[in-house]
Amino acid sequence: NSLATENRFVNSCTQARKKCEANPACKAAYQHLGSCTSSLSRPLPLEESAMSADCLEAAEQLRNSSLIDCRCHRRMKHQATCLDIYWTVHPARSLGDYELDVSPYEDTVTSKPWKMNLSKLNMLKPDSDLCLKFAMLCTLHDKCDRLRKAYGEACSGIRCQRHLCLAQLRSFFEKAAESHAQGLLLCPCAPEDAGCGERRRNTIAPSCALPSVTPNCLDLRSFCRADPLCRSRLMDFQTHCHPMDILGTCATEQSRCLRAYLGLIGTAMTPNFISKVNTTVALSCTCRGSGNLQDECEQLERSFSQNPCLVEAIAAKMRFHRQLFSQDWAD
């Protein structure tokens, strides 16, 4: 499950920039746009961030280049560079236009067949909970075990360094096989099994990964938007986990929504299970003190805690994980 290289993707932003740099007009327009978006490091109020005419002109010049449709991949090398390029060529999205739009990540889904040797689990007691079983499957897999230990170490201790913990969490969810990562986090527990639920809730080391002082959700989002990676992951989540109807239909596919959800873990917008007795997830933030933005704040909160697409996607994956162990694996 090696890291993907840029070349594997139809139109990665790093490749598109190389092409652009070979064309003097494209290169000049791109460089000019770079200066237009450099103010991103300090988010501005919308009215102050209106783009100047020359910045809009530079953006227009790139309309016909391959940069305009470029994308990045969650598992690519130099992902940060790729995302920087993406946000440079999409200045309107960078400068306050946060309507749900196109995810910066490419839209192809390559669902790999389930690859796990479940027979190794016979060393566990047959009645062990499934979160324990999935944790064991990770332990028995060298790469998963190594990555999990890395974030375990970074996220442990009384005085853990949160930024290092988050970086290692991101590394785990980017580099571990998807089946291991999803199995570990989205393991099903019996409703009465609080121990299992607690294990699941502690998967992402919330005592270190989540903020010690609960921030306002809108402040959290603003903080996220100031960082290209977090902004990208949030837009990916908004794109793929948008519910189309009350049945819980996702705007794209459940698998893409789950991938986007897992992509938020290790960012400022890290979600988690809120209790050991159910599968409700939420951001670690509050809408208290939102003033006249209370509705907007609650909508952000609900996009995690009461999102029928996400709820359905998590439930379906947990059903799948339960079925894996209900089959007879002796053969």
Partner: antibody
Framework: QVQLVESGGGLVQPGGSLRLSCAAS????????MHWVRQAPGKGLEWVSV????????YYADSVKGRFTISRDNSKNTLYLQMNSLRAEDTAVYYC????????WGQGTLVTVSS | DIVLTQSPATLSLSPGERATLSCRAS???????LAWYQQKPGQAPRLLIY???NRATGVPARFSGSGSGTDFTLTISSLEPEDFATYYC?????????FGQGTKVEIK
């Protein structure tokens, strides 16, 4: 390529039955909620029915409830609409649709209920 | 049932003009579940906007949606010749899902 193809339409007498099929190709059919929508000649769109990914949940418009049954066979990538006790007002072009961000609609199949 | 009422029934405009179409619900609709479609004669509908304000895949930027609660709007900033068609709103917030009766945008 990604497409939906309806079949099974035709002329039927009032009180009769018809079964519409919608064959899906080019995408993972079982990953999507599916709808039937109809349009009477010269009229607007009317939502008919919806079925969840696995077929466990189905819902209907009041005008067809108790007479129409939506179902799916994910192994065959096919959506169905069983229409019983047909009435003249059921005459329409019937579309099957995948209503998501990248939507897909079939070309429609005409059902005519007339004596 | 949630009844959606679209207005006007017909809109006569010239290419390049701005079109504003209204969709009013008989009761509050969660904006996540409000969609707009375009349909041309002899063709199947095409999703334009979902979640009240989000453009579907491949939809040009001149189409935008807005609104919440019971009042929703589809705006076409500058009409192109290919935009003359019938537009429908749909709610998927309560069963049965329902469509509005449509607004026909015709060439003046």
């Amino acid at each position: 390529q990604v497409q939906l193809v309806e079949s099974g339409g035709g002329l039927v007498q009032p009180g009769g039955s018809l079964r519409l099929s919608c064959a899906a190709s080019g995408f993972t059919f079982s990953n999507y909620t599916m709808h039937w929508v109809r349009q009477a000649p010269g009229k607007g769109l009317e939502w008919v029915s919806v079925i969840s990914y696995d077929g466990s949940s189905t819902y209907y418009a009041d005008s067809v409830k108790g007479r129409f049954t939506i179902s799916r066979d994910n192994s065959k990538n096919t959506l169905y609409l069983q229409m019983n006790s047909l009435r003249a007002e059921d005459t329409a072009v019937y579309y099957c649709a995948r209503i998501v961000r990248m939507d897909i609609w079939g070309q429609g199949t005409l059902v005519t209920v007339s004596s | 049932d949630i009844v959606l009422t679209q207005s006007p029934a017909t809109l006569s405009l010239s290419p390049g003009e701005r079109a504003t179409l209204s969709c009013r619900a008989s009761q509050s609709v969660n904006s996540h579940y409000l969609a707009w479609y375009q349909q041309k004669p002899g063709q199947a509908p095409r999703l334009l906007i979902y979640g009240a304000s989000n453009r579907a895949t491949g939809v040009p930027a001149r189409f935008s949606g807005s609104g919440s609660g019971t009042d929703f709007t589809l705006t076409i900033s500058s009409l192109e010749p290919e935009d003359f068609a019938t537009y429908y709103c749909q709610q998927m917030d309560g069963f049965p899902f329902t469509f509005g009766q449509g607004t026909k945008v015709e060439i003046k």
